[in-house]
Interface confidence: low
Amino acid sequence: EAHKSEIAHRYNDLGEQHFKGLVLIAFSQYLQKCSYDEHAKLVQEVTDFAKTCVADESAANCDKSLHTLFGDKLCAIPNLRENYGELADCCTKQEPERNECFLQHKDDNPSLPPFERPEAEAMCTSFKENPTTFMGHYLHEVARRHPYFYAPELLYYAEQYNEILTQCCAEADKESCLTPKLDGVKEKALVSSVRQRMKCSSMQKFGERAFKAWAVARLSQTFPNADFAEITKLATDLTKVNKECCHGDLLECADDRAELAKYMCENQATISSKLQTCCDKPLLKKAHCLSEVEHDTMPADLPAIAADFVEDQEVCKNYAEAKDVFLGTFLYEYSRRHPDYSVSLLLRLAKKYEATLEKCCAEANPPACYGTVLAEFQPLVEEPKNLVKTNCDLYEKLGEYGFQNAILVRYTQKAPQVSTPTLVEAARNLGRVGTKCCTLPEDQRLPCVEDYLSAILNRVCLLHEKTPVSEHVTKCCSGSLVERRPCFSALTVDETYVPKEFKAETFTFHSDICTLPEKEKQIKKQTALAELVKHKPKATAEQLKTVMDDFAQFLDTCCKAADKDTCFSTEGPNLVTRCKDALA
């Protein structure tokens, strides 16, 4: 239904707190360099304006679109050109081009310092003084670093943060209460960020159809008792919600997400038997809970899939009559039978099926041609299963840090032209898959591993797109989203790469490394490892292990020495010489 004033409608639907939070996220995601205070001022102005429209929908400007209202606010910021350069050119455009322009200027890797958590005492003081401002800072800092973060989900994480602080700031030992809990929220939020970025990439690069296919597969796995019409309805609604969030329409996105949660809870009988616990929760927790609800029990009486999709003599007729519906049904039927497959794998299988029908339905004897299609799926299924087994075995043998190093060597060999910081970030993220997925039950490993790896590789592609340096990476990133992970896995040593010359300063360390937190120490060592591989791309695992063990021993010795500086300056050159010899 059309509303006289869109802004009044959204303010009424969302309520002041969520309205303000979402406007703050929107501004922070568009203008990533502005301070919290600058954005907070804009948010207050927009909120005050929304209230005047709630009081009188016919008041001046209340009939304007949200893009127009928000865009005008952003474009009125002083010194926009000095701070944002060419982004200021967006303000010369009219809607909807202006919003598209803002979206194109979102930076996936802004030049901002890492978000450092203050110490417990200071955090609790500022939280107690002004909880609203404290949470505003959290929303601002996360949103500007993650310009595609799923906005309603970010409100959920802010709520989690709030609850943790409320609880822990009342304890005697605030630090030991806060640290593990906030670390847990941070880890979940980072995973949520890369997953959502993948969804927006899917939408941006391949359109709504691609995202809807993803949604059909995912929802069919989770709700195998829902019929195809129900799954299609949910997938259509979910596609709309994600399209809005990816497009910067955060108020509409959050409002529609709340509507979808409401619909699901009102229709549990036709969707899933597992929703009640989620539906008993308040809004943000309810929507979050529904998004990761456990799979419903698969119906016991599902017939073999071949009957409808291989053995039926009408396959080509059914396909020709409504291609998308027929393929959607195939994806639904396959996915509801395989909660143990990754969505990426299911989409590859559907793509294979589509290609087979396109080819076979044009031939003289189609059934003979498409009759073997299920056997052709086997290698497609075996490949990721083998990947999971090999990598989880390696993770169990090496632990997370060692596993990250193995991946770092592998990926540096595949794409040595990529910058070392990018390779280290990617390998550390890819390596976390072990901790995240390899401890899960067997049937959950494959979906966990492959869909997580796909999301991380999507980030690699986004970063590489801005600075294309490796033909290997360009090749894998240019294809469809679901083929990326197999493409990266299949890459071997880049034979075209000319090894980097050995520079002693790259491997020269100082005593300041001793006082770094463990994570930073690991990054320093992993940076050195990547540089070693760039120097000797064909070094054996044994050679690299020898050098890294020597390096670890050197750090351990010098960091324990009475005169650290002298130890580093005398032992350092010896280490460099030994490294060169070991790799010669």
């Epitope: 350069g85 030049s111 990529v418 910058s419 910081p421 990018t422 801005k466 600075t467 294309p468």
Partner: nanobody
Framework: EVQLVESGGGLVQEGGSLRLACAAS????????LGWYRQGPGNERELVAT???????SYADSVKGRFTISRDYDKNTLYLQMNSLRPEDTGLYYC??????????WGQGTQVTVSS
């Protein structure tokens, strides 16, 4: 610390040409956008032209058809070819490199003066 050094500025007659160059002191792998900016006497710094790593270019309306931005990947250098220069093109020209992993880099600037 990587430095950007502009060169090629100078005094030129109206209608003349200049080619500005901006060289980085070392290879920068994490570039995502390169640009030329200028600051005329008593004016704010303004965007002249940008080029992405995929070589798509964008120009200010006032220089379209007269200026061409380009880059030499191997030499790590950004160029601005300026033809049909006008007095209003006078100013200090800066190059900027927007990076993916580090903060953006600005050059010190090179002076361009167009006499009528």
């Amino acid at each position: 610390e990587v430095q950007l050094v502009e060169s090629g500025g100078g005094l030129v007659q109206e209608g003349g040409s200049l080619r500005l160059a901006c060289a980085a002191s070392e290879r920068i792998w994490d570039i995502n956008l390169l640009g030329w900016y200028r600051q005329g006497p008593g004016n704010e710094r303004e965007l002249v032209a940008t080029i992405t790593v995929g070589d798509s270019t964008s120009y200010a309306d006032s220089v379209k058809g007269r200026f061409t931005i380009s880059r030499d990947y191997d030499k790590n250098t950004l160029y601005l070819q300026m033809n049909s220069l006008r007095p209003e093109d006078t100013g200090l020209y800066y190059c900027k490199i927007r990076r993916t992993w580090h903060s953006e880099l600005w050059g010190q600037g090179t002076q361009v003066t167009v006499s009528s």
